[in-house]
């Protein structure tokens, strides 16, 4: 059985993986602000945590998927202010018991150390300093993602 | 609500630079960017570039060699020089409140009166 | 940098009537990202349309913005004596953002 949330997740993940491939992206575009090989987007305005996901969606982007502590260090510190909480792509799963990515993945457990409970309906956010785990219908703010393409050299074999 | 409030000298001698101060009041100045846009005499609006409130810019290609941007989010300010000024440059400049792409405040909500900037000896 | 071009540059009508003004772009505008502007003689210009369609906070109902791609269109549907403008088009779904030369919208 599974919940709205994921249901959701999993529609918008099928539809953009419908979608035609487009050509890389070398450069962040405008108001995107780069961060090592991803280009990120903050909202100013707030916002449940599906809500969020679609607007990811229709910006041909997606809720923000964080590697390591490594990357979210690098994110907190894109955040000025430390009362601000922004949602990234990591929901509870009802189904899986688990915490799970919105691209299927699971939450390694030492990635991420979570503030609040695992449960039904709960949504992760981040601040400045922690993460959170949240009511996934609290209107927050979110970060949305686009990858870069790596420029790789072509080698060429000797002549 | 938020409000925008420009300042600085209304005559620029040529080859001078010229100095433009914007002051938010009623709102924060964080997560959003904020556009200098400029209105010649009787013409159109040509944008002139963006700052975000962490310091990163977009400039208009066609100014960019004379233009900087900065901000100060503890004054709630931010700043626009552009060098080298002709008579060109003689213009209404606007600052604004760019919402960007994120909705419900999408592309410039809000924006100051104007300061008419004339380039003259 | 993409072009917007204005249609038509000046548009006569009475109070009541219903207005069309067109912006054609050179290429197509990423996620619909174009705006629509008014101005008054001695004032800032003033957001009216954001998204192609979606109204500004505070603008009233007879104002509406359609379009996609290339070719979008404000329609003001009765004219109030207070319309008679300025009005602006701007894509911002690509740098450098750009506006139309403008419609000038005056009384019959």
């Known amino acids: 059985q599974k919940s709205s949330i994921e249901k959701c997740s999993v529609d918008i993940q099928q539809s953009r993986n419908k979608t035609t491939e487009r050509p890389g992206l070398l450069n962040c575009p405008i108001y995107w602000q780069q961060l090592r090989e991803k280009c990120l987007l903050f909202s100013h305005t707030v916002n449940p945590w599906n809500n969020s996901l679609a607007d990811c969606s229709t910006k041909e982007s997606s809720l923000l998927l964080i590697r390591d502590k490594d990357e979210l260090i690098h994110t907190q510190n894109l955040i000025r202010d430390k009362a601000i909480l922004f949602w990234i792509g990591l929901n509870f799963s009802l189904s899986e018991k688990n915490w799970k990515w919105i691209n299927g993945s699971f939450l390694n457990s030492n990635d991420l150390e979570i503030r609040g409970d695992a449960k039904e309906n709960s949504c992760i956010s981040i601040s400045q300093t922690s993460v959170y785990s949240e009511y996934c219908s609290t209107e927050i703010r979110w970060i949305c993602q686009k990858e870069l393409t790596p420029v790789r050299n072509k080698v060429y074999p000797d002549s | 609500q938020v409000q925008l409030q420009e300042s600085g000298p209304g005559l620029v001698k040529p080859s001078e630079t010229l100095s433009l101060t914007c002051t938010v009041s009623?709102?924060?100045?964080?997560?959003?960017?904020w556009s200098w846009i400029r209105q010649p005499p009787g013409k159109g609006l040509e944008w002139i570039g963006y700052?975000?409130?962490?310091?990163?810019?977009n400039y208009n290609p066609s100014l960019k060699s004379r233009v900087t941007m900065s901000v100060d989010t503890s004054k709630n300010q931010f700043s626009l020089k552009l060098t080298s000024v002709t008579a060109a440059d003689t213009a209404v400049y606007y600052c604004?409140?760019?919402?960007?792409?994120?909705?419900?405040?999408?592309?410039?909500?809000?924006w100051g009166q104007g300061t008419m900037v004339t380039v003259s000896s | 940098e993409i072009v917007l071009t204005q249609s038509p540059g000046t548009l006569s009508l009475s109070p009541g009537e219903r207005a069309t003004l067109s912006c054609r772009a050179s290429?197509?505008?990423?996620?619909?990202?174009l705006a629509w502007y008014q101005q008054k003689p001695g004032q800032a210009p003033r957001l009216l349309i954001y998204?192609?369609?979606s109204r500004a906070t505070g603008i009233p109902d007879r104002f509406s913005g359609s379009g996609s791609g290339t070719d979008f269109t404000l329609t003001i549907s009765r004219l109030e004596p207070e319309d008679f403008a300025v009005y602006y088009c701007?894509?911002?779904?690509?740098?450098?953002?750009?506006f139309g030369q403008g419609t000038r919208l005056e009384i019959k």
């Open positions: 604004a409140r760019d919402g960007g792409i994120v909705g419900a405040t999408e592309a410039f909500d809000i």
């Open positions: 009623g709102g924060s100045i964080s997560y959003y960017y």
């Open positions: 700052i975000y409130f962490s310091g990163s810019t």
């Open positions: 290429q197509s505008i990423s996620g619909s990202y």
């Open positions: 998204g192609a369609s």
């Open positions: 701007q894509q911002y779904g690509s740098s450098p953002i750009t």
